[in-house]
């Protein structure tokens, strides 16, 4: 027996109750591919979600977040509250970044300032809650008579202490 359902286009479903006839998706539902046995319920953009694209018989609705929130997850599956720069979202709401950390966005977590000395550099501009530190040249590079052509110090093998 040939499966007539494969002939049903997007926007329809294959109605088993009516000899595999292709019936249009009812209101508030869609099928984005052909040969479907059911239309799916359209996503509804309610509450903190707002509609970016209306549902049609062949494609699902797409949501964004209302002002003051931002999308998280695939296809904006969740909306998370925005915080100010210099803050992060906790279970108790937006909290200022602790000293030594920063967040330059309205979302995400506070991250530690860059440790300039790890790269042998000095702090050129101090960090704030909203901005990372700016690292400058190493102190040695700033000393009088330092040449930009100074060859790098030889790397020592791991596990060997200097003689």
């Amino acid at each position: 027996l040939q499966d007539l359902c494969s002939n049903c286009p997007a926007g329809t479903f294959c109605d088993n109750n009516r000899s595999q006839i292709c019936s249009p998706c009812p209101p508030n539902s869609f099928s984005s591919a052909g040969g479907q046995r059911t239309c799916d319920i359209c996503r509804q953009c309610k509450g903190v979600f707002k509609t970016r694209k209306e549902c049609s018989s062949t494609s699902n609705a797409e949501c964004d977040c209302i002002s003051g929130y931002h999308c998280l997850g695939a296809e904006c599956s969740m909306c998370e509250q925005d915080c100010k720069q210099g803050q992060e979202l906790t279970k108790k709401g937006c909290k200022d970044c602790c000293f030594g950390t920063f967040n330059d966005q309205k979302r995400g977590i506070c991250r530690p300032w860059t440790n300039c000395s790890l790269d042998g550099k000095s702090v050129l501009v101090n960090g704030t809650k909203e901005r990372d530190v700016v690292c400058g040249p190493s102190p040695a590079d700033l000393s009088p008579g330092a040449s930009s052509a100074t060859p790098p110090a030889p790397a020592r093998e791991p596990g060997h202490s200097p003689q």
């Epitope: 479903f13 088993n16 508030n28 539902s29």
Partner: antibody, heavy 121, light 106 residues
Framework: QVQLQQSGAELARPGASVKMSCKAS????????MHWLKQRPGQGLEWIGY????????NYNQKFTDKATLTADKSSSTAYMQLSSLTSEDSAVYYC??????????????WGTGTTVTVSS | QIVLSQSPTILSASPGEKVTMTCRAS?????IHWYQQKPGSSPKAWIS???NLASGVPARFSGSGSGTSYSLTISRVEAEDAATYYC?????????FGSGTKLEIK
Amino acid sequence: QVQLQQSGAELARPGASVKMSCKASGYTFTFYTMHWLKQRPGQGLEWIGYINPSSGYTNYNQKFTDKATLTADKSSSTAYMQLSSLTSEDSAVYYCARSDGSSSKWYFDVWGTGTTVTVSS
Amino acid sequence: QIVLSQSPTILSASPGEKVTMTCRASSSVSYIHWYQQKPGSSPKAWISATSNLASGVPARFSGSGSGTSYSLTISRVEAEDAATYYCQQWSSNPFTFGSGTKLEIK
């Protein structure tokens, strides 16, 4: 005959997660959507959401978007629901129920046996 | 979301009596489904799309209605009809159920 056999009762601590199953038999699993419903003792029914096993598409009652995760395994004709961050409010009987997609009237024609979840410290 | 209000909450009837329970929607819906649930059991499909009896449901049951007002009628109640009856809609997401009418047999 068409049957939906659900996994056994679960006892869980607050904050924990549980994953229950609903094994379908007697029909073509991918031709129907699978819905999940909640019933608290002595109360009515609440729709949690559904999965279309054919495509994996899910649609949730917004009340349960952060609580429930629905999945399905076509090879074993089994639907699953995971509930996370459990509280006493989640203590209930949970049903899976089949909906005949081809009628598109979203009517639950076959119901599972129910899984009782008890959340207690 | 659409709220379904069922009345009465409890309905007491004698065998052979005719009973009617109603389901009112807060907004107009296209159709209503009905389910029967007995204590300790899963709900059962009872009436679909307002008036279609599910397989195995006795002919003494009937359903009717449109818009915001729907009803389930039993022409001659029998002892085995004692149960809670729920109405359900999906004209608007999410699916919602009424709080149920409990039918008691005297």
